[in-house]
């Protein structure tokens, strides 16, 4: 029979490559049986996970699972790092695996060539 423990479905060593400036939703899939647990997000700083206060979060309910979502609107370069969600269930703290966001800063990653550079490289126009 299926366990009635709360389970957090974040894959171990999961990663997301995202762009600074874009919106992004980081999902924590939560399986529970009766009462929805209290869920929070934290960001890893070394070995400690710092709770994310004052961040926009929301719930999305689906048939067999619920998603606790951390919103990035927009993604900032310093959002780079590892995140974990945790659920309080019957006085127990259940922690997910951590998931890592790799943020590409579009400005530094894909600086457009200047007009001078374009002029010196006419083959780029074709």
């Amino acid at each position: 029979k299926e366990s009635c423990d709360v389970q957090l479905y974040i894959k171990r060593q999961s990663e997301h490559s995202i762009l600074a400036g874009d919106p992004f939703e980081l999902e924590c899939p939560v399986k529970y049986c009766a009462n929805r647990p209290h869920v929070t997000w934290c960001k890893l700083n070394g070995t400690t996970c710092v709770k994310l206060e004052d961040r926009q979060t929301s719930w999305k309910e689906e048939k067999n699972i619920s998603f606790f979502i951390l919103h990035f609107e927009p993604v900032l370069p310093n959002d780079n790092g590892s995140y974990r969600c945790s659920a309080n269930f019957q006085s127990n703290l259940i922690e997910s695996h951590s998931t890592t966001l790799y943020v590409t800063d579009v400005k530094s990653a894909s600086e457009r060539p200047s007009k001078d550079e374009m002029a010196s490289r006419p083959w780029l126009l074709y």
């Epitope: 974040i10 171990r12 999961s14 997301h16 695996h97």
Partner: antibody, heavy 119, light 112 residues
């Protein structure tokens, strides 16, 4: 019934490319990581890399980086291994394996695809 | 890369024997969640590998209880308590704690 069914044996010439498929069924591919493993004739197992079908994120072993491309199409529950610029030394059995990503509760292997590279 | 060293490389034993295969990693396999991601696989000639044990000591469903795994940190053991004819095969340890994931070189278990 859980199955990982790989595409059939291939014979290729040096310099050619090849894409091997691994069709999964009996579980949700998005809940897993798909690994690819090489076994040269009479030798041990070598990890090539893995793909997260849920978001496309891929990790490669440095030994294979640039030589192979791993991908998946979650809509048809199929993973792929592409081998480019084939050499005789790429002759081997290639296996896909699907490991549950959350709690490692299952680890299934495909039957293998034998690739022979010969001029 | 983490080196996985299995010993012995080959082993002759008889049906009913107790057999132990060891696997040593060049660094700890303890992940930050406190678990060691160490698998044992069995491969028979001409067949695909099959996972027997994961997370050091958890048996896959359908795997006979004569197989057991133990260990921590860098030293791990696969034990077969009473060898059966179908157990003669090659056994591999595989770590999936640290990238790139790595296998041991294999231990070939043969009939004496």
């Amino acid at each position: 019934e859980v199955q990982l069914v790989q595409s059939g044996a291939e014979v290729k010439k040096p310099g050619e490319s090849l894409k091997i498929s691994c069709k999964t069924s009996g579980f949700n591919i998005k809940d897993t990581y798909i690994h690819w493993v090489r076994q040269m004739p009479g030798k041990g197992l070598e990890w090539i890399g893995r793909n997260d079908p849920a978001n496309g994120n891929t990790k490669y072993s440095p030994s294979f980086q640039g030589q192979v491309t791993i991908s998946a199409d979650k809509s048809i529950s199929t993973a792929y291994l592409q081998l480019s610029s084939l050499k005789a030394s790429d002759t081997a059995m290639y296996y896909c394996a699907s490991y549950e990503g959350y709690y490692e509760r299952f680890g299934y292997w495909g039957q293998g695809t034998l690739v022979t590279v010969s001029s | 890369d983490i080196q996985m060293t299995q010993s012995p490389s080959s082993l002759s034993a008889s049906v009913g024997d107790r057999v132990t295969i060891t696997c040593r990693s060049s660094q700890s396999l303890l992940d930050r969640d406190g678990k060691s991601y160490l698998n044992w696989l069995q491969q028979k000639p001409g067949k695909a590998p099959k996972r027997l044990i994961y997370l050091v000591s958890k048996l896959d469903s359908g795997v006979p209880s004569r197989f057991s795994g133990s260990g921590s940190g860098t030293d791990f053991t696969l034990t077969i308590s009473s060898l059966q004819p179908e157990d003669f095969a090659t056994y591999y340890c595989w770590q999936d704690t640290h990238f790139p994931y790595t296998f041991g070189q294999g231990t070939k278990l043969e009939i004496k």
